[in-house]
């Protein structure tokens, strides 16, 4: 049997393999061992077999998708029926009070491969034996205690295929230079040591992607937008673009990249090499976003230029014409660098919203029957923009981090925005105070600290009889700059 | 739809070089090889080679090496097929057709450019 | 380079009737060969790939088999619209290779 019988349901072309050469993988037309690599076709009885315990999954994922060029790296990891676990000298073993359908093992392991490698019969001198090769005969890799390796896994795409000796999670990276674009197909087949030979325990498929548009994605974040994912912002306050670029294997850390925005509302284009840019809607209305990424990525030479044609009189034969009879393009040159680009289009709509909430004011409410340790505090609050429709507070500690209260309720506001919010204060101390304004599209925030001392009854009684003058020493309120803008505030005497 | 549409007939002197072209659309251009095909008159199908759009290699036949050149342009999603140092022989309607990613075989094909090499 | 040996070179055969055309590979193509119906003046169509699937839109009388070096096309019961002359193309390696064609005619 070939490699491509084993591992694909069809021989694949010299063409596939010719226009998608992988460094360091072999042709599937080698041949396979299948006297030490058994084949077992799906649905054969002997799956059932194949594992003490029940199945075992092997989980294929990659980080496709894939700029041409760069490395893809593919990951396989193992997962066991319940209860086993690879312990570190790479043999299967039952966890430590774990039940399963066969109850608690007296036995601790599943496989014990120790004491199969101690038996070094029919090795020779180099410490190699006839069964320590892979499926093609390629004798295993002799890295640092590679005797606890017990499974092989055989990685196939594209006509060609990659051995590797390992435990129960491997990986390997495949440089993506020569790869057709498009959807590609990675399959794996795992085997397990079994004496002087290997058994098939498991077999995946996965598809990835390789490209030649550098994957683009774009956060979109605004202050005071209720719903950063719903594409809806708000008039007159900057959004920020977060470009983020998949580049898994940093193929792109030395290029150079430029970032063309175009906002769709009539601003022109804007070309940054900042990956993070703010910008302004001054309209309501949709608009349609386009970024264009460029990135001077590592790639493959022009072809040299044709040479002049011959002259019509014979010349002497230059030896066989055999060497390279197809023409293929030189090898790229590492020094070669090629442009490519990546695109973001998004529609956003702008609508109105809370802006900007100032609390301008804070008055401590007297109390002809105060509790004898709650306070009632007025906070009088403007905004800027749409007009709210909720409006929520938040108490905690001084260091806003421990909430002690949160109350939301419906307001009413005319079209100046002003309104009084009144909240209690259990006990003296020193509070943080959290504001929030809100409609169906916007959340607009302001925090304060404010400290609320001591009072005895007969002092409150007293200030309450007074008729008020002054109440408002007893309390200070200190603003948090939040958001990076300024907000007044006022005592008031 | 996937189309590809090749410039118009030309007429030659042997020595002189034609520059054929095939605009592409309704696809990813940069995905697929386009290949360049030819049929001489009453004759069969003979494939000359391929050009990768997404990074400009080539694969010529060995009959056209040093006579063929391949070339692309991204921007206007344009191969393009040079032949020099024409012949009568060459008298041919030219090809290009789109592989179907790893598989040569072609789905599509542009409707043909007739070469005339005549002195 | 592979040689692609198609046979016969013309065929005619009654509407209705079974039309069989034979391609010979000079080594092992399998599975990668393809069929072509070209009519006067206009491009190739393809038929079939990969030795045995049909293209999209083909009419189903139309069918492939073979493997290793010998190929077939079945048109199960021909039609005036099949005549045309076809071709079969290993999509193996390259050079890309074609047979010389097969006029299909009716009787």
């Known amino acids: 049997k070939r490699f491509h019988d084993v591992l694909g349901n069809e021989r694949p072309s010299a063409y596939m393999r010719e226009h998608n050469q992988l460094n360091g993988w072999s042709s599937d037309e080698n041949d396979w061992n299948e006297k030490l690599y058994p084949v077992w076709k799906r649905g054969d009885m002997r799956w059932k077999n194949s594992w003490k315990g029940g199945r075992v999954q092997a989980v294929l994922t990659s980080d496709s998708p894939a700029l041409v060029g760069s490395n893809i790296t593919f990951v396989v990891n193992l997962v066991f029926p319940r209860c086993q676990k690879e312990d570190a000298n790479g043999n299967i073993v039952y966890e430590k009070n774990c039940r399963n359908e066969a109850g608690l093992s007296a036995d601790p392991y599943v496989y014990n491969w120790t004491a199969w490698s101690e038996d070094s019969d029919g090795e020779n001198g180099t410490g190699q034996s006839h069964h320590n090769v892979f499926p093609d005969g390629k004798p295993f890799p002799h890295h640092p205690g590679w005797r606890r390796w017990n499974f092989v896994y055989v990685f196939h795409t594209l006509g060609q295929y990659f051995q590797k000796l390992g435990r129960c999670s491997v990986r390997v990276s495949v440089n993506t230079a020569n790869v057709t674009l498009g959807p590609q197909l990675m399959e794996v087949t795992v085997y397990r040591r079994h004496g002087r030979a290997y058994v098939p325990i498991a077999q995946v498929k996965d598809v990835y992607v390789v490209t030649d548009q550098i994957p683009v994605f774009v956060t979109m974040s605004q202050k005071n937008d209720r719903n950063s994912s719903d594409e809806t912002f708000l008039k007159d306050l900057p959004i920020t673009f977060d470009v983020l670029i998949h580049d898994p294997s940093h193929f792109l850390n030395y290029s150079t990249i430029n970032y063309k925005w175009s906002f769709g509302d009539n601003t022109g284009l804007f070309v940054s090499i900042n990956h993070t840019v703010n910008h302004t809607y001054v309209l309501n209305g949709t608009f349609s976003l386009n970024l264009t990424v460029k990135a001077a990525a590592p790639g493959p030479c022009p072809p040299p230029p044709p040479p002049p044609p011959r002259p019509p009189k014979p010349t002497p034969s230059l030896g066989p014409a055999g060497d390279n009879p197809l023409g293929l393009s030189e090898i790229p040159d590492e020094n070669c660098q090629i442009n490519r680009y990546g695109h973001f289009q998004a529609t956003i709509t702008i609508v109105e919203g809370i802006l900007e909430v100032n609390i301008i004011q804070t008055t401590d409410v007297l109390m002809l029957v105060p509790g004898p340790d709650s306070s009632l505090i007025d906070f009088v609050v403007t905004c800027q923009g749409s007009i709210p429709t909720e409006v929520c507070t938040i108490i905690s500690d001084p260091t806003c981090e421990i909430t002690q209260n949160a109350v939301c309720s419906p307001v009413d506001v005319d079209e100046m925005c002003l309104l009084t919010v009144r909240r209690a204060f259990n006990g003296s101390g020193t509070y943080c105070v959290n504001l929030t304004l809100g409609d169906d599209t916007s959340l607009a925030l302001t925090s304060t600290l404010i400290s609320v001392p001591d009072r005895d009854p007969a002092s409150s009684l007293r200030m309450a009889n007074s008729g008020g003058g002054g109440l408002n020493d007893i309390f200070e309120a200190q603003k948090i700059e939040w958001h990076e803008h300024h907000h007044h505030h006022h005592h008031h005497h | 739809q996937v189309q590809l549409v090749q410039s118009g007939a030309e007429v030659k002197k042997p020595g002189a070089s034609v520059k054929v072209s095939c605009k592409a659309s309704?696809?990813?251009?940069?995905?697929?090889?386009m290949h360049w095909v030819r049929q001489a008159p009453g004759q069969g199908l003979e494939w000359m080679g391929e050009i990768n759009p997404s990074d400009g290699r080539t694969n010529y036949a060995q009959k056209f090496q040093g006579r063929v050149t391949m070339t692309v342009d991204k921007s206007t999603s344009t191969v393009y097929m040079e032949l020099s140092s024409l012949r009568s022989e060459d008298t041919a309607v030219y090809y290009c057709?789109?592989?179907?990613?790893?598989?040569?075989?072609?789905?599509?094909w542009g409707q043909g450019t007739l070469v005339t090499v005549s002195s | 380079d592979i040689v692609m040996t198609q046979s016969p070179d013309s065929l005619a055969v009654s509407l209705g009737e079974r039309a069989t055309i034979n391609c010979k590979a000079s080594?092992?193509?399998?599975?990668?060969l393809a069929w072509y119906q070209q009519k006067p003046g206009q491009p190739p169509k393809l038929l079939i790939y990969?030795?045995?699937y049909r293209y999209t839109g083909v009419p189903d009388r139309f069918s492939g088999s073979g493997s290793g070096t010998d190929f077939t096309l079945t048109i199960s019961s021909l039609q005036a619209e099949d005549v045309a002359v076809y071709y079969c193309?290993?999509?193996?390696?390259?050079?890309?290779?074609f047979g010389g064609g097969t006029k299909v005619e009716i009787k």
């Open positions: 193309q290993q999509h193996y390696s390259i050079p890309l290779t």
């Open positions: 057709a789109r592989s179907g990613g790893n598989y040569a075989w072609f789905a599509y």
């Open positions: 080594q092992d193509v399998s599975p990668s």
């Open positions: 309704g696809y990813t251009f940069t995905s697929y090889w």
């Open positions: 990969s030795a045995s």
